[in-house]
Interface confidence: medium
């Protein structure tokens, strides 16, 4: 019979013959012959292959380097790579998460608009009129100025974007 020019899914053509690919998690040891099946072997510890393949070597799992602020989010298997993420307080510098940088803190006069995640930095916003922040924080929002009126007090010192208003007793002397 005519030798095949194309093979079915999960097969590959070699020496005019269709051989089965190795399943995910296994590597190729030897191609099939007229008389034998494809020979595959499982990937070793800390190795993986994530597709049907004819690779003779498995890929090494990614190393989550703690010196770069990385930790393991999901341990690799023989069929999947290790997924790294950043330690708490840090976020990835790229989609591949090859290294991490420290979350930014919002300085006094600025509040947190959006708390950082493992992949995005803190978003700070200036405290608008009527609000203040006197801390350097990766978590704290701008706080509203104290309402002196609701305490039956008057403003003795105006607030700023970094300081609260200072309330004091009402002047009882009236003309």
């Amino acid at each position: 019979p005519e030798p095949p020019t194309a093979c079915r899914e999960k097969q590959y053509l070699i020496n005019s013959q269709c051989c089965s690919l190795c399943q995910p998690g296994q590597k190729l040891v030897s191609d099939c012959t007229e008389f034998t099946e494809t020979e595959c072997l499982p990937c070793g510890e800390s190795e993986f292959l994530d597709t049907w393949n004819r690779e003779t070597h498995c890929h090494q799992h990614k190393y989550c380097d703690p010196n770069l602020g990385l930790r393991v989010q999901q341990k690799g298997t023989s069929e999947t790579d290790t997924i790294c993420t950043c330690e708490e307080g840090w976020h990835c510098t790229s989609e591949a998460c090859e290294s991490c940088v420290l979350h930014r803190s919002c300085s006094p006069g600025f509040g947190v608009k959006q708390i950082a995640t493992g992949v995005s930095d803190t978003i700070c916003e200036p405290c608008p009129v009527g609000f203040f922040s006197n801390v350097s924080s990766a978590f704290e929002k701008c706080h509203p100025w104290t309402s002196c009126e609701t305490k039956d007090l008057v403003v003795q010192q105006a607030g700023t974007n970094k300081t609260d208003v200072v309330c004091g007793p009402q002047d009882r002397l009236r003309a």
Epitope: L102, N134, S136, S137, A138, F139
Partner: nanobody, 118 residues
Framework: EVQLLESGGGLVQPGGSLRLSCAAS????????MRWVRQAPGKGLEWVST????????YYADSVKGRFTISRDNSKNTLYLQMNSLRAEDTAVYYC???????????WGQGTLVTVSS
Amino acid sequence: EVQLLESGGGLVQPGGSLRLSCAASGFTFWVYDMRWVRQAPGKGLEWVSTISATGVHTYYADSVKGRFTISRDNSKNTLYLQMNSLRAEDTAVYYCAKYPPAGRFDYWGQGTLVTVSS
């Protein structure tokens, strides 16, 4: 100069409790977020918990959630870690750290050793 002095560690049986303290000086304590990290024997640093400057926001590692409580007293410049239902795997040297550091966890005290063993 930033100084952090941890205390309150010791030997405790599994299921027991301890309260760690961290006395801070050399910086305006109430302005900064603070955190606890720990280092088990032969292991790397592990983040435990973070508290925001005013104490409104608290965050915990999954391994301690529901058992540990972080708090602070800004009038006393002191950070606390209440540790309940302690397990053998909580054995470590515990450090408090200012956030953000100039580098990675760069302001250290001498740490306080917590040993959980029967």
